[in-house]
């Protein structure tokens, strides 16, 4: 006999990185017929939705109107059909950005390199932080972490044209509170005869950085679903 239902999906719209004082919606998608959804924050109950009519709804939205450091952290959701509860969703790390200061991003040996050259990014922030994050624009962008007192280095190793693109970095005051983004640095990689075009990006994911920029400039962009940045297994 089945003891639990399949875990729901959780994501943030428009983005898991939320500038302070901007709005964000946490979405939880379970199954049609679910009579209750619960959103948990750092392990404690945060909100409850009992959709009506349950048989016609398989996704609920939890609205956060004013992002701040108290709302930043790890969220998960569960749902119930009858008396049977689901497994908890993956964790959604909701991050507040635009806190305090702006780091400086530089690249060595420079922004224009030949394929095969070793490239290192440096992110510097003079205020009290020891963790730094490097993000590359694009659909399949992921966060690289680096550590240092006022500066972290991000060695990319020998680069290919897949490394071409625009990079930004953040200083992190804790796992879920980040600085303003640095000014962008565009890395241009030339000389790879095998592949001179930009590497195709994963078309199944929205443009992560582009979506974040929309949140900073115009607030919440309606109906733009973005899966959380941790993989949904």
């Amino acid at each position: 006999q089945q003891q639990t239902l399949p875990k729901p999906f959780i994501w943030a719209e428009p983005h898991f990185m939320v500038p302070k004082e901007k709005q964000v919606t946490i979405c939880c998608q379970g199954n049609y017929g679910a009579v209750e959804y619960q959103l948990h924050f750092e392990g404690s109950l945060f909100a409850v939705d009992r959709p009506k009519p349950p048989e016609r709804i398989n996704k609920v939205k939890f609205y956060i109107p004013d992002m701040n450091s108290r709302m930043a952290g790890q969220y998960s959701c569960i749902y119930r059909v009858g008396e049977l509860w689901s497994e908890p969703s993956n964790l959604l790390d909701l991050v507040v950005t635009e806190m305090y200061d702006t780091p400086t991003l530089s690249v060595h040996p420079g922004p224009e390199v030949i394929s095969g050259e070793k490239v290192t990014f440096y992110c510097r922030l003079d205020t009290a932080t020891s963790m730094f994050l490097l993000l590359k624009e694009g659909r399949s962008s992921h966060v690289q972490r680096g550590y240092g007192k006022v500066q972290a280095e991000f060695p990319l190793g020998p680069v290919t044209t897949a490394h071409r693109g625009t990079y930004r970095c953040f200083g992190s005051y804790n796992n879920h509170a980040w600085s303003f983004p640095s000014e962008p640095v565009k890395l241009l990689v030339t000389g790879d005869i095998e592949n001179t075009s930009l590497a195709p990006e994963d078309p199944t994911f929205p443009d992560t950085w582009g979506t974040y920029l929309l949140t900073t400039e115009t607030g919440l962009q309606k109906d733009h679903a973005l899966w959380d940045h941790t993989a949904q297994n």
Epitope: Q23, L45, F46, A47, V48, D49, P51, V60, K61, Y63
Partner: nanobody
Amino acid sequence: DVQLVESGGGLVQAGDSLRLSCAVSGRTFSRLPMGWFRQGPGKDREFVAAISWSSSTTYYADSVKGRFFISRDNAKNTAYLQMNNLRLEDTAVYYCAAVGGSLDYSATVVYTAARAYADWGQGTLVTVSS
């Protein structure tokens, strides 16, 4: 400015009933989820009950389930907490709270975490004696 004003507190005996009111001004009350919290002597603030803006969803702390009932009258910009069969351990200052932001809340959602609430009343004291 947003104002939440609680009333209805007082001294009652165990087993009695009491009805708290929370009048809200300065916000679009009819589209805001609301909640009640309490803080007993020497204790942390704890969740009591919450209600969606449409009244379709209510949610209660286990300690008050079946005894307390939350309701609202959107036409009067007022939320209520009906407290029955009061116990000694219900002695506390009771606060009503409203979430922040605009009109984007689901009609069926309630918030149970104090951090989700932006605006708070000054509180009303409920004392239950034996």
